[in-house]
Interface confidence: low
């Protein structure tokens, strides 16, 4: 439906508060280095302009596209070239090239200081002094650090953030009330950002068809009682929402997401029996709840898939008539029967089925050729099952920290060219799969583990894309979205790697390590472990374990010493010498 003024349309649909919040997120995700005050000024200007268009849709410039209006506004920033360098060249382009240019300059790892949490009293005072500015600052800081964060979901996080401060700043023990809530929001926020980053990568690097296939599989698992036509409609709408958000069209995205939630709730009888509670919630909570809703029960009397997809004489005819529809139905039917499979496994099975039909439908006897296609699925299913079984056993044996260390060693040996901070971050997240998924029963382990690993490996891919250093990483990241995890699993030690020169400075520690949180201390030790492996890629597990045990003892001893700094200096030298000897450096 065409509107005379797109900006007026979105302002009216979303309301002033959401409009301003979404424009702030959009601007912060594009210009990640700009000060908060500059963004607020730009947002206020856009908002005032939108209000004039609401009053009179025929007013000057009100007919311009949102990209034109927002791009023009971003290009008024005086320090664009000094701050962003070549991104300033985007402003010489016309839409839609200008917006594409801004999108290409989004930085997944911006050079921004770590967010340090102030004292609780300081935060509560700031909250009470100016609640609106306090919450805007939250949106700004998250959006600029996570330029692909799902904008309507960030509004939901901000609502919870506000609720936490409203409740806890009045509590007797403010810190006890607030800090766990903030930790939870931080961890959930990081997870949400990473999940959305995979959706955007899927759309941008592999195209709409890849995203739609993912969505068909996931929604079919979640809504196994919904018929194919219903799932197809949801997939089409969901694809539009994510395409918009990933493309920086945040107002349209939030508006369309609200429409989709409304549609789902109005049609829940033909979608899922699990939606009732979600649909009673306010909009932001409703949309979040729907996105996280548990899988509905599978219908009891589903027929065998073989009849329609293997035994039928019409398989090639049906496939030829509408290839993607037929494959979509196959994926839907397989997925709704297998909530115990990961989405990526289901997509591998569908790809195998497609490849078989492409080959067999051109053969002399197609049926004879594809008759055993389901047998080809067995090894594809068993591979992740076995991998998860082995790794969960290892996790249960080692615990999370040591399991992360095992993965650090494994991945550093596979791709030693990758930067140490990236290897630490990615391996720590890979290691979290243990506590996240191994507690689940068999039927839930694979979808939990393998789909989570897809999200984490995508982090590696997007970070590596910014500064490519390893052909092996590039190959695994770009060849096939659904085979990324098997591709990385299949990598062996990189025999071509020339070990890094030994640098004693890398292994020099100071008393400040003693005041770090347990998590920060782990990261320091894990950073040292990666560096050790880079120096000695052929070191055995036993050698590395001995060095790490010595290192842990050294930190513990010096943190208890009266003169910590001297202890770190003297004992550190001894540790480095002993480690060199142990590893033959």
């Amino acid at each position: 439906d065409a509107h005379k003024s797109e900006v007026a349309h979105r302002f009216k649909d979303l309301g002033e508060e959401n409009f301003k919040a979404l424009v702030l997120i959009a601007f912060a995700q594009y210009l990640q280095q700009c000060p908060f005050e500059d963004h607020v000024k730009l947002v206020n200007e856009v908002t005032e302009f939108a209000k004039t268009c609401v009053a009179d849709e025929s007013a000057e410039n009100c007919d311009k596209s949102l990209h034109t209006l927002f791009g023009d506004k971003l290009c008024t920033v005086a320090t664009l070239r000094e701050t962003y360098g070549e991104m300033a060249d985007c402003c010489a382009k016309q839409e839609p090239e200008r917006n594409e240019c801004f999108l290409q300059h989004k930085d997944d790892n911006p050079n921004l200081p770590r967010l340090v949490r102030p004292e609780v009293d300081v935060m509560c005072t700031a909250f009470h002094d100016n609640e609106e500015t306090f919450l805007k600052k939250y949106l700004y800081e998250i959006a600029r650090r996570h330029p692909y964060f799902y904008a309507p979901e960030l509004l939901f996080f901000a609502k919870r953030y506000k609720a936490a401060f409203t409740e806890c700043c009045q509590a007797a023990d403010k810190a006890a009330c607030l800090l766990p809530k903030l930790d939870e929001l931080r961890d959930e926020g990081k997870a949400s950002s990473a999940k959305q980053r995979l959706k955007c990568a899927s759309l941008q690097k592999f195209g709409e068809r890849a995203f739609k296939a993912w969505a068909v599989a996931r929604l079919s698992q979640r809504f196994p009682k919904a018929e194919f036509a219903e799932v197809s409609k949801l997939v089409t709408d969901l694809t539009k929402v994510h395409t918009e958000c990933c493309h920086g069209d945040l107002l349209e995205c939030a508006d369309d997401r609200a429409d989709l939630a409304k549609y789902i709730c109005e049609n829940q009888d033909s979608i899922s029996s699990k939606l009732k509670e979600c649909c009673e919630k306010p909009l932001l909570e409703k949309s979040h709840c729907i996105a996280e809703v548990e899988n509905d029960e599978m219908p009891a009397d589903l027929p065998s898939l073989a009849a329609d997809f293997v035994e039928s004489k019409d398989v090639c005819k049906n496939y030829a008539e509408a290839k993607d529809v037929f494959l979509g139905m196959f994926l839907y039917e397989y997925a709704r029967r297998h909530p115990d499979y990961s989405v990526v496994l289901l997509l591998r099975l569908a790809k195998t089925y497609e490849t078989t039909l492409e080959k067999c439908c051109a053969a002399a006897d197609p049926h004879e050729c594809y008759a055993k296609v389901f047998d080809e699925f067995k090894p594809l299913v068993e591979e992740p099952q076995n991998l998860i079984k082995q790794n969960c056993e290892l996790f249960e044996q080692l615990g999370e920290y040591k399991f992360q260390n095992a993965l650090l060693v494994r991945y550093t040996k596979k791709v030693p060219q990758v930067s140490t901070p990236t290897l630490v971050e990615v391996s720590r997240n890979l290691g979290k799969v243990g506590s996240k998924c191994c507690k689940h029963p068999e039927a839930k382990r694979m979808p939990c583990a393998e789909d989570y690993l897809s999200v984490v490996l995508n982090q590696l891919c997007v970070l590596h894309e910014k500064t490519p250093v390893s052909d092996r990483v590039t190959k695994c990241c770009t060849e096939s979205l659904v085979n990324r995890r098997p591709c990385f699993s299949a990598l062996e030690v990189d025999e071509t790697y020339v070990p890094k020169e030994f640098n004693a400075e890398t292994f020099t520690f100071h008393a400040d390590i003693c005041t770090l949180s347990e998590k920060e201390r782990q990261i320091k030790k894990q950073t040292a472990l990666v560096e050790l492996v880079k120096h000695k890629p052929k070191a055995t597990k036993e050698q590395l374990k001995a060095v790490m045990d010595d290192f842990a003892a050294f930190v513990e001893k010096c943190c208890k010493a009266d003169d910590k700094e001297t202890c770190f200096a003297e004992e550190g030298k001894k540790l480095v010498a002993a480690s060199q000897a142990a590893l033959g450096l």
Epitope: P224, K225, A226, E227, F228, A229, S232, M298, P299, A300, D301, L302, P303, A307, D308, S312, D314, K317, N318, E321, A322, V325, M329, E333
Partner: nanobody, 114 residues
């Protein structure tokens, strides 16, 4: 191409029963939705019932009185209509959904009258 042929319509007394059949031929597979719509005299076509593996849906006006079923081996869908009322009088159309469109039969007339 898909062809659908309905049968089983006719004249029946109020509170009586009828069983409609619809046989599909052509490019058919059992996992697709099949079902029934009807068009009362002088009114728009309206949804009656549909069936999908493991799932059935009914219009509120027929719930508890009509039962849809399917025989995949015969590519046939049935509509068992009990406790018929005069307002059930209509041409009943069978449909089959594939590739984002519905295929329709020619229709069979059901008249409920004393």
């Amino acid at each position: 191409e898909v062809q659908l042929v309905e049968s089983g319509g006719g004249l029946v007394q109020p509170e009586g029963s009828l069983r409609l059949s619809c046989r599909a031929s052509g490019s058919i597979f059992s996992i697709n939705t099949m079902g029934w719509y009807r068009q009362p005299p002088g009114k728009e076509r309206e949804f009656v019932a549909r069936i999908y593996p493991g799932i059935t849906h009914y219009a509120d006006s027929v719930k508890g009185r009509f039962t849809i079923s399917r025989d995949n081996a015969k590519n046939t869908v049935y509509l068992q209509m009990n406790s018929l009322k005069p307002e059930d009088t209509a041409v009943y159309y069978c449909f089959y959904y594939y590739d984002d469109r519905n295929y329709w039969g020619e229709g069979t007339l059901v008249t409920v009258s004393s």
